[in-house]
Amino acid sequence: APVLPGEDSKDVAAPHSQPLTSSERIDKHIRYILDGISALRKETCNRSNMCESSKEALAENNLNLPKMAEKDGCFQSGFNEDTCLVKIITGLLEFEVYLEYLQNRFESSEEQARAVQMSTKVLIQFLQKKAKNLDAITTPEPTTNASLLTKLQAQNQWLQDMTTHLILRSFKEFLQSSLRALRQM
């Protein structure tokens, strides 16, 4: 079974070594989640031809997946530490419903999907501790999430496969941008 960062022998601190700092924990968690996404993408791509599909734009219009934009202050030009951190946390909170959707979408990688979801929850907690401006962070409404989940699960098989592919791809891009930005914080 996949192991969360800090649980495997490589991460267990030797008796006299210090525990991971908050930045180290965040960095390790993001890289761990990215590894998980790679494994999930592998299964998705092996199972269907979605990874080569040219019809992505069609399905993407129906999804409102979090994306980094210039105004979020996470890119090299116009970088803003506070604004960006709020965007990263808000984006991760918005991704949670999509990660919930992924839970029943995998056969051989079922545990990996659960580990990505759980590790994302832990990552959000670490980032919230780091953020000063918590007031600016908006949490999605549970009712909105519930109806979105129902809608996604009611799609036909092709759209569900496409949705799975798009969620993984978008989440990977979001985390990679987050990782780059966090390294200037």
Epitope: Q76, F79, N80, R183, Q184, M185
Partner: antibody, heavy 120, light 111 residues
Framework: EVQLVESGGGLVQPGGSLRLSCAAS????????MSWVRQAPGKGLEWVSR????????YYADSVKGRFTISRDNAKNTLYLQMNSLKPEDTAVYYC?????????????WGQGTQVTVSS | SYDLTQPPSVSGSPGKTVTISCAGT?????????VSWYQQLPGMAPKILIY???KRASGIADRFSGSKSGNTASLTISGLQSEDEADYYC??????????FGGGTHLTVLG
């Protein structure tokens, strides 16, 4: 063209203070974490301090903790190092350095350095 | 004494290959892929060559390459040229949000 120009170095007595400045140009200063690295005469490099892009987080080498303070003014594109309780072993060339974007712990640009001499 | 151990000097003839080692611990070199290498020509500020263990910085010739095995990193310079004569420093992230450097290695290009 990226430029980092240090100033404020000089001769100071043990126990004294100095404030180093680094004027940055040719890039969006507020987007980058910055550091100070020093080099004692004829010796190797030693990392001194780091500050995040927005100035929220700061880190220090044990050898300067409690004596040196790193800060920045993004409106003026300037990095600072306030050095108090200076010791002879602080004598070195102090370099202002920029962290590579999106890379953890690597310096892609260095200033030419400013000499600090602590002696009675 | 420096936190990372480098040989004080290495030498090689033009056109040949030299390797500079940088030994650390599991808390720095062995912790992640956070090793970088810098070249310092006499009287000049250091210049980045390699970051993240093996990625070449912009504008750096492919004669320079980096690698890592366990707690030891290495910089390899192939096709040695006279202008490569300089001091070379390795640096690594160390657990606890700090950076440590090696003591530096002076490369002499013979002949």
């Amino acid at each position: 063209e990226v430029q980092l120009v240090e100033s404020g170095g000089g001769l100071v007595q043990p126990g004294g203070s100095l404030r180093l400045s680094c004027a940055a140009s040719g890039f969006t200063f507020s987007s980058y974490a910055m550091s100070w690295v020093r080099q004692a005469p004829g010796k190797g490099l030693e990392w001194v301090s780091r500050i995040s892009s927005g100035g929220i987080s700061t880190y220090y080498a044990d050898s300067v903790k409690g004596r040196f303070t790193i800060s920045r003014d993004n409106a003026k594109n300037t990095l600072y190092l306030q050095m108090n309780s200076l010791k002879p072993e602080d004598t070195a060339v102090y370099y202002c350095v920029r962290y590579a974007w999106g890379v953890q712990w690597a310096f892609d640009f260095w200033g030419q350095g400013t000499q600090v001499t602590v002696s009675s | 004494s420096y936190d990372l151990t480098q040989p004080p000097s290495v030498s090689g003839s033009p056109g040949k290959t030299v390797t500079i080692s940088c030994a650390g611990t599991s808390s720095d070199v062995g912790y992640g892929n956070y090793v970088s290498w810098y070249q310092q020509l006499p009287g000049m500020a250091p210049k980045i060559l390699i970051y993240d263990v093996n990625k070449r910085a912009s504008g750096i010739a492919d004669r320079f390459s980096g690698s890592k095995s366990g707690n030891t990193a290495s910089l390899t310079i192939s096709g040695l040229q006279s202008e490569d004569e300089a001091d070379y420093y390795c640096a690594s992230y160390r657990r606890g949000e700090t950076i440590v450097f090696g003591g530096g290695t002076h490369l002499t290009v013979l002949g």
